[in-house]
């Protein structure tokens, strides 16, 4: 999947754009908002009716090297009595993010953008059954 | 930056960290071919903490369209289909990386940007701190 060119007529390519070889793009990986701290809701992963755990995945050839993945703790959902109820199901919620992959081919190095699917948390849903006769 | 294992036979001039600026292929590699997104889009209606999806569009960003979730109710939907305010619907937020055109309007020059998105909602037990 290619990154779309700026297609809007009101965009004029500025003279200040850096020269880029064909088929590639220049990417500054100094992250904008890198140090912005977000106030996340307090331990919602444990208080949810579809609770989840976190696992950190580490890959030194990926930037960022650390990606956190959630896994639903239960198959069903936790009811008002604190017991698991399988008439409802815990399901993972996923979101795509971008990472930069560094590839070694002999002594040369290339960089590739990659979409990674991150499981962010879980929600409790009504199960659906498709019955095929 | 992060440390990269290097082939020991290669010249030692290469920096072990990711350089600040890299040239990348225009094609984005998507290794998630085994995912099945076709049915997951109805969570927002089937959840006990349902949400609406709002389109956030920015042509200076890739991806230019990001969908933001907003919880429909303060409470959660109970077994009878009514909103139960003893439980709370809360957004699940995630920091993701996107590309920002830099300098602005340039077709092939980007910078990574971290943004916070609400991906969906989950139903939680509220915490009440009583201050005497």
């Amino acid at each position: 999947r290619k990154i779309p060119k700026v297609g809007h007529t009101f965009f004029q390519k500025p003279e200040s754009c850096p020269p880029v070889p064909g088929g590639s793009m220049k990417l500054d990986i100094g992250i904008i908002n890198e140090n912005q701290r977000v106030s996340m809701s307090r331990n919602i992963e444990s208080r949810s009716t579809s609770p989840w755990n976190y696992t950190v995945t580490w890959d030194p050839n990926r930037y960022p090297s650390e990606v956190v993945q959630a896994q639903c703790r239960n198959l069903g959902c936790i009811n008002a009595q604190g017991k698991e109820d399988i008439s409802m199901n815990s399901v993972p919620i996923q979101q795509e993010t971008l990472v930069v992959r560094r590839k070694h081919q002999g002594c040369s190095v290339s960089f590739q953008l990659e979409k990674v699917l991150v499981t962010v948390g879980c929600t409790c849903v009504t199960p659906v059954i498709h019955h095929v006769q | 930056g992060i440390t990269i294992p290097r082939n020991p036979g290669c010249p030692n001039s290469e920096d072990k960290n990711f350089p600040r600026t890299v040239m990348v292929n225009l094609n984005i590699h998507n290794r998630n071919t085994n995912t099945n997104p076709k049915r997951s889009s109805d969570y927002y209606n089937r959840s006990t903490s349902p949400w609406n999806l709002h389109r956030n569009e920015d042509p200076e960003r890739y991806p230019s369209v990001i969908w933001e979730a907003k919880c429909r109710h303060l409470g959660c939907i109970n077994a009878d289909g009514n909103v139960d305010y003893h439980m709370n619907s809360v957004p699940i937020q995630q920091e993701i990386l996107v590309l920002r055109r830099e300098p602005p309007h340039c077709p092939n020059s980007f910078r990574l940007e971290k943004i916070l998105v609400s991906v969906g909602c989950t139903c939680v037990t509220p915490i009440v701190h009583h201050v005497a």
């Epitope: 198959l75 199901n89 399901v91 849903v125 199960p127 659906v128 059954i129 | 099945n36 089937r46």
Partner: nanobody, 119 residues
Amino acid sequence: EVQLVESGGGLVQAGGSLRLSCAASGRTFRPYRMGWFRRAPGKAREFVTLISWSSGRTSYADSVKGRFTISRDSAKNAVYLQMDNLKPEDTAVYFCAVDLSGDAVYDSWGQGTQVTVSS
């Protein structure tokens, strides 16, 4: 295309046991979870048990907890339901169901297998 076939139902006296089997076709069978649900005349459909395919973690409805055991055999693409200490209220048609992608959308096939518990 995955398909499931259930077997092992029958007529049994209260307190007896049955073992239901569910065989899945399809070489690349890697579901998120599988389960058994039942339909009894005049009653709502009820999930009795679920199993995570990757971890083998199990969950049961209160009505069968301690009496029913679900298990899986990854090599045979099969799930089993061991039903012990059966009660007349367990009488129903039992269906095997598969959630392929973890979205709680289950596919089931065919007529199921009839379990009848006499008192």
